[in-house]
């Protein structure tokens, strides 16, 4: 029967009429000619997290699509011989008579393939989240374990403190917190975890032994040690935390003082014309994610803006600049400034007392999240996210967000480089105004406010548990400046990377190991990406990310200040202009010199190299206290460890809910550090069954010191 | 329901004539078909004998089959016939008529014999 | 016309047992080849066009190959239903030169 048509076969036929050979149905167009080529298609799993049945679906999907292009393919041809004047057989007339249907069939495949792909990558997505977010969680439950190590090395060390072994003893109320054999076990087990240097073992196997002893510790173990278990211990130990101890009134306390907190601010509408009020969030409990958050907008891609709107800056907004400006001192030297014509005119307010009850005014109107970032939380050696910030949301696995860091201001920096380890002393402050980064021109420099270094201080009365204020920007808007030219671009912050899109509000009332460092929180949620081009947006941001300050158009002098009272201690290191990527933008700015944070390694304190490079019997030069004029009591001294997990406990700063008073450093402007002067109430020695000199060094070993002038 | 029903079998003697219709339905005989008569003698194998394009009306046959049948068809009528001349006794067998090469009738005996 | 030799015109094997039969044409027929299963008093039913494309329905146990002049047939393994007799046809056709629909002889398959 005429089943065959014309032959591309080597056959001597000729061209001779089709065969008649009738195929049916579909079968009829998989087979003849050659095949069409198969379409290429995405690798159907892209790794390991791909679940198996996926990829078998899409294996089908993949399989049945190659047979359909090949059939498609096929039908061309014989359509085309067709039109040729050729003739088909039957098999192939019946193909040519399903084109539609294999056309079509091809289209759903195609389609049911992308859908099962988007599906595919959905799962991946998915578990990806899954996976970081359980990393993130045991990061968090490993940072909670430093944590509590951390206060309980410093509860030890405070233990070889006659007058705190006494005030233990005596108790709170004249109830005992410790017992004398308690102390005594403590002391038996701080020689476990502190243990003298024993030459005949390596450092490491050494520390290793304490860890042991720490971990089994902190597991609360039935496991017997000195005359003890862990567990006794673990108890012990918990109940120092709970005894609000270190929390009472011989130590001072960081927060803003009563009459602060009570003061409002002066209104500054007629400077932000077009700004709408918004009122300042109340004060809401910590664990609360913030509801209005400052987005640095030059941090997200230009393309992803497609708003043509005038950005706004809310009023309260700007005030906010003003006080983080405020915080932030940069030195004179700084190569001179020309003022760019701004909306808003900084103007050197005349009386600095005047100046420091403004900003502390503002600071105790702000009540809403304001969320401080520490530095050590900006540590990301190993690419790994801020555990503090897990509880808010798993940032999604595709968007690596970089975390900037606030600059210091430059000083000495031609050594800088050579010896980034050296703690230069700030010769004078002047005030580093942020450039906020909207549109239209827009730059915030507000009003510098120059608290001059009273030497009366406040006293303080029940603190405010956190300083927060929200800074609103709203994130729908365009951007039309990014950041700077290399040239022009003085400052920026050093991003970080991997961090979460959300972040709830750290407690500036820190632990002193984890000096306080404002930083906008670029956290904040951006504008949602396509959920089928987050994969391809691996590389979108860039690696680090530039922030612009423009230097102080108005020299401001500041005779007041004294060498002594300027001890802060800042590491900061002048990075090269090249060292960040910048982003091209019509944002003009000064020429500055370009001060930069790199990553440090020491996560865990205050991330600044501060005490870094110093001899160890040198950690009492970190321990003193300063003078009654700033009120600052240095040390561990101002803090209560909690060592229970709180529900904030995720927080590594918000465990110390007493504050500590930095606030001669916060309101003149300076990034208080961790230090420890030279006045540590006294070494441990004898009561500690110690024998032998009594070890200067009582604290971490691993800090190292250095030196301030 | 597609099917092809074949008719017109029946014994002749040699030397004579015979028409076989083969009558199709469930499909039209304006598509893109091949028509085509099979033949298989009792205990032997399938033997082409023509077909016919239904598009076009064109035809082939087997050699043997030249000159003495005739392929024809009826678009009005979804009837496709087999005219059998000068019979032989050879000739006898189960004539099946096909659509392509997968739809059959169930064939209709011819027998030649005097 | 065109001529195809199928062989072996009988075979015996067992349950399980692969089975091939062979189709030759007497000149090129490309891939246009037919294999049909007919059992007794039953038109054929078509197994394979195109010289290896399964018709819908068909056990995947059924397999063709070839092209040009030499093509096979093959059961992979041999089932009680397979007894029939299974026969190759050129489904070419040309307009100049009628190829013609030629059968093979066919090929009697049995269970030892």
């Known amino acids: 029967m005429p089943s065959a048509t014309s032959h591309s076969g080597s056959g001597s036929k000729s061209s001779g009429p089709p065969p008649p050979s009738g195929s049916s149905g579909s079968e009829a167009a998989a087979g003849a000619g050659a095949a069409a080529p198969a379409s290429q298609h995405p690798a159907t799993g892209t790794g390991a997290v791909q679940t198996e049945a996926m990829k078998q679906i899409l294996g089908v999907i993949d399989k049945k699509l190659r047979n359909l292009e090949k059939k498609k393919g096929k039908l061309d041809d014989y359509q085309e011989r067709m039109n040729k004047g050729e003739r088909l057989n039957q098999d192939q007339l019946d193909a040519v008579s399903k084109y539609q249907e294999v056309t079509n069939n091809l289209e759903f495949a195609k389609e049911l393939q992308r859908s099962f792909m988007a599906l595919s990558q959905d799962i991946q997505k998915t578990i990806k989240k899954t996976a970081r977010r359980e990393q993130l969680m045991r990061e968090e439950a490993e940072q909670k374990r430093l944590k509590t190590v951390l206060e309980l090395q410093y509860v030890l060390d405070k233990l070889g403190d006659d007058e705190v072994r006494t005030d233990l003893k005596q108790g709170l109320n004249g109830v005992p917190i410790l017992s004398e054999e308690e102390l005594s076990l403590l002391d038996e087990f701080y020689k476990l975890v502190d243990p003298e240097r024993d030459m005949s073992l390596r450092l490491n196997e050494q520390y290793e032994h304490a860890s042991i002893h720490l971990w089994d510790l902190l597991e609360g173990k039935e496991k017997p040690v000195c005359g003890t278990t862990y567990k006794v211990l673990k108890e012990i130990v918990e109940r120092v935390f709970q005894s609000n101890y270190f929390d009472s009134t011989h130590n001072h306390q960081n927060g803003l003082c009563e009459e602060e907190e009570a003061a409002s601010a002066p209104a500054v509408e007629d400077q932000v014309p077009e700004a709408e009020p918004e009122p300042a969030e109340e004060y809401t409990e910590q664990s609360e994610v913030e509801s209005t958050e400052y987005v640095n907008r030059q941090f997200m891609a230009e393309t992803q803006f497609t708003s043509g709107e005038k950005e706004q800056v809310d009023e309260w907004t700007v005030e906010t600049v003003e006080v983080v400006n405020s915080l932030q001192q940069q030195p004179q030297a700084a190569s001179p400034s020309v003022p760019e014509p701004h909306s808003l005119t900084p103007v050197a307010q005349a009386d600095p007392l005047v100046r420091r009850q403004r900003v502390q005014d503002l600071m105790a109107q702000m009540q809403g999240p304001y969320n401080f970032i520490q530095d050590s939380m900006l540590d990301f050696e190993n690419q790994t996210l801020d555990p503090a910030i897990v509880s808010a949301q798993p940032m999604n696995p595709t968007q690596n967000m970089d975390m900037p860091q606030l600059v210091c201001p430059p000083v000495h920096s031609e050594s800088r480089l050579a010896q980034p380890n050296q703690v230069p002393v700030q010769p004078e402050a002047t005030q580093v105004p942020l450039v906020s980064s909207t549109s239209e021109g827009y730059t915030a420099s507000q009003p510098l406010y120059q608290p001059s270094h009273a030497t009366e201080q406040r006293p303080q009365k029940e603190p405010i548990d956190q300083i927060q204020a929200t800074i609103s920007l709203n994130t729908d808007q365009t951007t039309a400046s990014s950041s700077l030219p290399a040239a022009s671009q003085p400052q920026v912050f050093q991003a970080g990377t991997s961090k979460p899109l959300h972040s709830s509000g750290i407690n500036v009332n820190a632990a002193p190991f984890q000096s306080m460092q404002t930083v906008f929180n670029m956290n904040a949620p951006v504008p949602p990406v396509n959920e089928p081009e987050t994969l391809k947006q691996q590389n979108q941001y860039q690696a680090s990310y530039n922030q612009s300050f423009s230097s102080q158009p108005h020299q401001v002098e500041q005779t007041e200040l004294q060498q002594e009272q300027l001890q802060t201690v800042v590491g900061t290191y002048h990075g090269s202009p090249d060292q960040s990527h910048q982003v091209t933008g019509n944002h003009q700015q000064p020429p500055q010199q370009n001060t930069g944070f790199p990553r440090s390694n020491q996560p865990y304190y205050n991330s600044r190299g501060v005490s870094r490079g110093g001899s160890r019997g040198a950690r009492g030069l970190m321990n003193g206290y300063r003078g009654p004029a700033n009120g600052f009591r240095g040390g561990y001294d101002g803090y209560r460890p909690s060592f229970s997990n709180t529900p904030n406990s995720g927080y590594t700063q918000s465990q110390f809910s007493a504050p500590r008073d930095y606030s001669g450093y916060q309101r003149d402007g300076y990034q208080q550090n961790f230090k420890r002067g030279s006045g540590q109430s006294g070494p441990r020695g004898a009561p500690r069954g110690r024998g032998g000199p009594p070890r200067p060094n009582r604290g971490m070993p691993q800090m190292n010191t250095q030196q301030v002038n | 329901q597609v099917q092809l029903v074949e008719s017109g079998g029946g014994l002749v003697k040699p030397g004579g004539s015979l028409r076989l219709s083969c009558a199709a339905s469930?499909?039209?005989?304006?598509?893109?078909?091949?028509m085509s008569w099979v033949r298989q003698a009792p205990g032997k194998g399938l033997e082409w004998i023509a077909y016919i394009y239904i598009g076009d009306g064109v035809t082939a046959y087997a050699n043997w089959a030249k000159g003495r049948f005739t392929i024809s068809r009826d678009n009005a009528k979804n009837s496709l016939y087999l005219q059998m001349n000068s019979l032989r006794a050879e000739d006898t067998a189960v004539y099946f008529c096909?659509?392509?090469?997968?739809?059959w009738g169930q064939g209709t005996l011819v027998t030649v014999s005097s | 016309d065109i001529q195809m030799t199928q062989s072996p015109s009988s075979l015996s094997a067992a349950v399980g047992d692969r089975v091939t039969i062979k189709c030759q044409a007497s000149q090129s027929i490309s891939s246009y080849l037919a294999w049909y299963q007919q059992k007794p008093g039953k038109p054929p039913k078509r197994l394979i066009y195109?010289?290896?494309n399964l018709d819908s329905g068909v056990p995947s146990r059924f397999s063709g190959s070839g092209s040009g002049t030499d093509f096979t047939f093959t059961i992979s393994s041999l089932q009680p239903e397979d007894i029939a007799t299974y026969y190759c046809?050129?489904?070419?056709?040309?307009?100049?030169?009628?190829?013609?629909?030629?059968f093979g002889g066919g090929t009697k398959v049995e269970i030892k």
């Open positions: 046809q050129c489904t070419a056709v040309s307009s100049a030169t009628i190829y013609g629909n030629a």
């Open positions: 195109d010289a290896s």
């Open positions: 469930g499909f039209s005989f304006s598509g893109s078909y091949y």
């Open positions: 096909a659509r392509g090469n997968r739809l």
